[in-house]
C-alpha cells in the first residue's frame, strides 16, 4: 500500500512570497506524485512547480492559489492511488486603490451644507484598518463636524462646508502590511464670498496693427474686484495706462481690448479676481504676435508614369501654425482623386505624362502667406532618332557611332565595348547627343558596341559591329639605320599589313638590282656573307591592289664589330699610389672608349686632376684613396655596336715592413708600383 510520510497542511501565506506544501510517500513500487487544486491537476509553471513530491510556490498568488490542494500518489503498474489530506492557504494581502466619491453621485452635486461621503478603495485580507488624511494631515473621529470610523473605509462629512475643502487621501494596514490610496480626491466646496471664475481669458494670436480682446469674469457675494496686470505687474486701468499700452481699454464686464497691437504689446496678461474673503484668483493669458517664416526651396522632381509619388511640403515656422494647401495651374487640389492633397503632402497616384508641370505649395496664417513652386517632370522611356549601325571605320582616322534618342528628361547615354563600360579618355569621347567618337581608330577597335539610353522611366539599347579598315602599314616599320657585321651572314626583315595581304619586295635605292648573294625572301633581305659593297640605301616596298604601295628606306652600314685588344685586369694599389686600368678596342668604324666607375659614367671633361683617360683608352688614377675602390667598366662603342668589360680596383694600406722581411720580399698580392 502507498503510505504518506508527510502530508500537506493548511497554512498562512503572504501574497507574492514563497511557500511550500510538503508531501512525502512510501510505496512498494515506483509511484508518481502529482497535485490537484480543487480536483483539477496542477500544471508546473515558473511560479508554482513540483519539487520532488512537494509543491513549491515562488510567489503566492491570492487569485490562482485560492482553493484546496491535494497530493496524489499513483502506482502506474497497479493503478492504485492514495490521496493526502486537503490543504489550503490563508493568503494575507493588501492592494491599493483610489479614493472615490460615494455620495452624492457626482462632483457637480456637491453643495455647501450637504452630506459628502468618500470611500477608500484599499482592499486586503485580513480586513484592513483605515486612516483618513486631508491635505496630508490625519483626521480623527468627531473632528470638525465629520464622522470618521477608522474601522470603516468610508469618510462622512456632515454637513460639508468650505472648511472641508482639500485633498483627501487614505491609508490602510493589516497583517500583510500597509498601502495608501493610488489616486486621491480633491473636495472643493465654494464659499460664496470667495471669487469664482465665470469666464477665463484665452491665449490670443493677432496680426500686427490688429486688435486683441481678453474676456475675464468672476462671481462672488458680494461682487468681487477685478484687475488687469501686464508682464511687469503694471496695472491696466482706463485712468492709468502704462506708456506701451496707450490703446488698452478695460470694459465694465471685465474684458480687456487692445487696439493696433505692436510687438511690445506681446506678453502675459493677468486677470485678478478678489472676493470679500479668500485668496485672489489669478488667471493668465498670453498675447502672441502672428508671424510666418519663409519656406524652404523644392528640388525639381522627376517621376515615372504609372507610379505613385508624394511631395511633402514642410510648412514654414509660424504662429499660429500656418495652414498648408497645394495648387496646380492656379486651382487648389482636392483631398481625394488621382492627384490630391493629403495632409501636407501632394499625392500623385498613377502618374500620367499630363501631370507634369509646376505645383505650388501655399502656407498662410494671420501674419501673411508664403508659396513655393516645385517643378515636376514626368519621365518617359527614350525613343530612337538614330540607332547605332554596323560601320566600317578607317584605321588611324576618327570614327563615329550614333545613338540619338529623345525623352523627358534628356536621356543619359552610356556606351559599352565588348560588354565593358567605355570611360571617356583620350581615345573615346561621348558627345551630349549620345554620339561616340573614337579618335585614331585602331585595329582592335573592331568589335561590338552597345549604347544604352536611360531616363528614370526606363531605357532602350542597341548594338552595332565595327569593322576596322586596316591601313597599309609596315609592322613594324623597319629601322632607318641598320648595321651588318662584315664577313658574316645578315638578315633585314620587312613586314606589312593591310586590308589585303600586301606583296613585299626589296630594291636598292638607286634602282640597281640586288647582287646574287643577296636574296629577297618574302620581305626578308638575306646576305649570305656581307661585303663592303653591300653597304648603302635600300627600299622595302609593300603593295596591294586596293591600297597601292608604301615604301620604307633603310641605310645599311657594313661594320667590323668591336673586339677588345687589351682588357682591364683586377688591380690592387697601395693608398696614395697610381692605378692604371688599361683598355684598348678595335672595330670599324673605330670605336670610342668610355669608362664607368662605381655606377656612373666618368665624363672626360669633368674628371679633375687625379684621373685621366688616354687616347688609347686606358684610365689612370693618381693618389688613389680607399673610396676609389670598386668596379670599373670599359665601354667601347661605335655607330653599329657597343661592348663592355670590367675589372675591380682594390685600394689597400701599405704594410709596415717587419724585420724578418728583407728588402727583396715580394708584396702579398699583384701590385702596380709607381
Amino acid at each position: 500500500a502507498i503510505v504518506f510520510i508527510k502530508q500537506p497542511s493548511s497554512q498562512d501565506a503572504l501574497q507574492g512570497r514563497r511557500a511550500l506544501l510538503r508531501c512525502e510517500v512510501e510505496a512498494p513500487g515506483l509511484v508518481h506524485v502529482y497535485w490537484l487544486l480543487d480536483g483539477a491537476p496542477v500544471q508546473d509553471t515558473e511560479r508554482r512547480f513540483t519539487q520532488g513530491s512537494s509543491l513549491s510556490f515562488a510567489a503566492v498568488d491570492r487569485l490562482q492559489d485560492s482553493g484546496t490542494f491535494q497530493c496524489v500518489a499513483r502506482d502506474d503498474v497497479t493503478g492504485e492511488e492514495a490521496r493526502s489530506a486537503n490543504a489550503s492557504f490563508n493568503i494575507k494581502w493588501i492592494e491599493a486603490g483610489p479614493v472615490v466619491l460615494k455620495h452624492p453621485a457626482s462632483e457637480a452635486e456637491i453643495q455647501p451644507q450637504t452630506q459628502v461621503t468618500l470611500r477608500c478603495h484599499i482592499d486586503g485580507h485580513p480586513r484592513p484598518t483605515y486612516q483618513w488624511f486631508r491635505d496630508g494631515t490625519p483626521l480623527s473621529d468627531g473632528q470638525s463636524n465629520n464622522t470618521v470610523s477608522s474601522k470603516e473605509r468610508n469618510l462622512t462629512l456632515r454637513p460639508a462646508g468650505p472648511e472641508h475643502s482639500g485633498l483627501y487621501s487614505c491609508c490602510a494596514h493589516n497583517a500583510f502590511g500597509q498601502a495608501c490610496s493610488s489616486q486621491n480626491f480633491t473636495l472643493s466646496i465654494a464659499d460664496e464670498s470667495f471669487a469664482r471664475v465665470v469666464l477665463a481669458p484665452q491665449d490670443v494670436i493677432v496680426a500686427r496693427n490688429e486688435e486683441a480682446m481678453f474676456h475675464c469674469q468672476f462671481s462672488a457675494q458680494p461682487p468681487p474686484n477685478l484687475q488687469w496686470l501686464f508682464e511687469d505687474e503694471t496695472p491696466i486701468t482706463n485712468r492709468s495706462r502704462p506708456p506701451h499700452l496707450r490703446r488698452a481699454t478695460v470694459f465694465a464686464n471685465g474684458s480687456l481690448l487692445l487696439t493696433q497691437v505692436r510687438p511690445r504689446n506681446a506678453g502675459v496678461y493677468r486677470c485678478i479676481g478678489q472676493g470679500q474673503r479668500g485668496p485672489p484668483v489669478i488667471l493668465e493669458a498670453t498675447l502672441h504676435l502672428a508671424e510666418i517664416e519663409d519656406m524652404p526651396l523644392f528640388e525639381p522632381r522627376v517621376f515615372t508614369a504609372g507610379s505613385e509619388e508624394r511631395v511633402t511640403c514642410l510648412p514654414p515656422k509660424g504662429l499660429p501654425e500656418p495652414s498648408v494647401w497645394w495648387e496646380h495651374a492656379g486651382v487648389r487640389l482636392p483631398t481625394h482623386g488621382r492627384v490630391y492633397q493629403k495632409g501636407h503632402e501632394l499625392v500623385l497616384a498613377s502618374i500620367a505624362e499630363s501631370d507634369a508641370g509646376v505645383y505650388t505649395c501655399h502656407a498662410a496664417n494671420l501674419a501673411g502667406q508664403r508659396r513655393q513652386d516645385v517643378n515636376i517632370t514626368v519621365a518617359t522611356v527614350p525613343t530612337w532618332l538614330k540607332k547605332p549601325q554596323d560601320s566600317q571605320l578607317e584605321e588611324g582616322k576618327p570614327g563615329y557611332l550614333h545613338c540619338l534618342t529623345q525623352a523627358t528628361p534628356k536621356p543619359t547615354v552610356v556606351w559599352y565595348r565588348n560588354q565593358m563600360l567605355i570611360s571617356e579618355d583620350s581615345r573615346f569621347e561621348v558627345f551630349k547627343n549620345g554620339t561616340l567618337r573614337i579618335n585614331n581608330v585602331e585595329v582592335y577597335d573592331g568589335t561590338w558596341y552597345r549604347c544604352v539610353s536611360s531616363t528614370p522611366a526606363g531605357s532602350i539599347e542597341a548594338q552595332a559591329r565595327v569593322q576596322v579598315l586596316e591601313k597599309l602599314k609596315f609592322t613594324p616599320p623597319p629601322q632607318p639605320q641598320q648595321c651588318m657585321e662584315f664577313d658574316k651572314e645578315a638578315t633585314v626583315p620587312c613586314s606589312a599589313t593591310g586590308r589585303e595581304k600586301p606583296t613585299i619586295k626589296w630594291e636598292r635605292a638607286d634602282g640597281s638590282s640586288l647582287p646574287e648573294w643577296v636574296t629577297d625572301n618574302a620581305g626578308t633581305l638575306h646576305f649570305a656573307r656581307v661585303t663592303r659593297d653591300d653597304a648603302g640605301n635600300y627600299t622595302c616596298i609593300a603593295s596591294n591592289g586596293p591600297q597601292g604601295q608604301i615604301r620604307a628606306h633603310v641605310q645599311l652600314t657594313v661594320a667590323v664589330f668591336i673586339t677588345f685588344k687589351v682588357e682591364p685586369e683586377r688591380t690592387t694599389v697601395y693608398q696614395g699610389h697610381t692605378a692604371l686600368l688599361q683598355c684598348e678596342a678595335q672595330g670599324d668604324p673605330k670605336p670610342l672608349i668610355q669608362w664607368k666607375g662605381k655606377d656612373r659614367i666618368l665624363d672626360p671633361t669633368k674628371l679633375g686632376p687625379r684621373m685621366h683617360i688616354f687616347q688609347n683608352g686606358s684610365l689612370v688614377i693618381h693618389d688613389v684613396a680607399p673610396e676609389d675602390s670598386g668596379r670599373y667598366t670599359c665601354i667601347a662603342g661605335n655607330s653599329c655596336n657597343i661592348k663592355h668589360t670590367e675589372a675591380p680596383l682594390y685600394v689597400v694600406d701599405k704594410p709596415v715592413p717587419e724585420e724578418s722581411e728583407g728588402p727583396g720580399s715580394p708584396p702579398p698580392y699583384k701590385m702596380i708600383q709607381t
Epitope: 508518481h32 490537484l36 483539477a40 499513483r74 497497479t78 492504485e80 492511488e81 490521496r83
Partner: antibody, heavy 111, light 109 residues
Framework: VQLVQSGGGLVHPGGSLRLSCAGS????????MYWVRQAPGKTLEWVSA???????YYADSVKGRFTISRDNAKNSLYLQMNSLRAEDMAVYYC??????WGQGTLVTVSS | EIVLTQSPGTLSLSPGERATLSCRAS???????LAWYQQKPGQAPRLLIY???SRATGIPDRFSGSGSGTDFTLTISRLEPEDFAVYYC??????????FGQGTKLEIK
C-alpha cells in the same frame, strides 16, 4: 481482479453511446482507471483516464466530445461518447494500471 | 508528446530462434516508465514487461527487456509456438496520458 465491459454497438455519425466497465476483486475507489481503444488493424490509442478523486484526463482527439466518470459506490467506470465520428470506430478497452484490462467492446460508427 | 517507433514492422522467425524487437522514443524516456505488451487476435493486450526490464507476474523468463534513454529492446530467447503475436511498447509518465508504439508483428517463418 476482474473488469467486465458493456455498452458497445452500432451508432450513426453524430450519435452518442455510453460504455460501462464494472470492477471487482479490488477496492475500486482507490484506483486510477482509464480507457484505451484499438481501431481495426491499428495500434492501441489511449483515450481517457480518471483518478481516484475524480480528476479527469483526455486525448486531444476526443476532448470536448467524450466524458469519463466513475461511481465508486457501484465499482463502475463510464465513458459517455457524443458527436461520434467514423474515426472513433474501434474496440474500446477499460483498464486498471498496466496489467488489468477488460475484454473489450466494439463501437461501430456507420451511416 | 513522445512518439514511439517500433522496428521491424514484421519479424519472420522459426520456433526455437531468438527474437529481438526494438522500440525508439522521439525524446528520452525514464527507463522506469516503459512497458511491453503482447496481443493475440481478438484478445486484450497482456503486460509482459514494466519499468523497461521487470517481468510482470506469470511471464516466462524467456522474455526479457533492456534499454534506457531513447532505445529499448524486448528479447525472446527461444521462441515457442504460442509467442507468435503482435508486440507493443508503451510509455507511461507522470500524467496518465499513455502512448503506444505502432507494433511489431512476430510471425512464423
Amino acid at each position: 481482479v476482474q473488469l467486465v465491459q458493456s455498452g458497445g454497438g452500432l451508432v450513426h455519425p453524430g450519435g452518442s453511446l455510453r460504455l460501462s466497465c464494472a470492477g471487482s476483486g479490488f477496492t475500486f475507489s482507490t484506483y486510477l482507471m482509464y480507457w484505451v481503444r484499438q481501431a481495426p488493424g491499428k495500434t492501441l490509442e489511449w483515450v481517457s483516464a480518471i483518478g481516484s478523486g475524480g480528476d479527469t484526463y483526455y486525448a486531444d482527439s476526443v476532448k470536448g466530445r467524450f466524458t469519463i466518470s466513475r461511481d465508486n459506490a457501484k465499482n463502475s467506470l463510464y465513458l459517455q461518447m457524443n458527436s461520434l465520428r467514423a474515426e472513433d470506430m474501434a474496440v474500446y478497452y477499460c483498464a486498471r494500471g498496466l496489467g488489468y484490462w477488460g475484454q473489450g467492446t466494439l463501437v461501430t460508427v456507420s451511416s | 508528446e513522445i512518439v514511439l517507433t517500433q522496428s521491424p514492422g514484421t519479424l519472420s522467425l522459426s520456433p526455437g530462434e531468438r527474437a529481438t524487437l526494438s522500440c525508439r522514443a522521439s525524446q528520452s524516456v525514464s527507463s522506469s516508465y516503459l512497458a511491453w505488451y503482447q496481443q493475440k487476435p481478438g484478445q486484450a493486450p497482456r503486460l509482459l514487461i514494466y519499468g523497461a526490464s521487470s517481468r510482470a507476474t506469470g511471464i516466462p523468463d524467456r522474455f526479457s527487456g533492456s534499454g534506457s534513454g531513447t532505445d529499448f529492446t524486448l528479447t525472446i530467447s527461444r521462441l515457442e509456438p504460442e509467442d507468435f503475436a503482435v508486440y507493443y511498447c508503451q510509455q507511461y509518465g507522470s500524467s496518465p496520458m499513455y502512448t503506444f508504439g505502432q507494433g511489431t508483428k512476430l510471425e512464423i517463418k
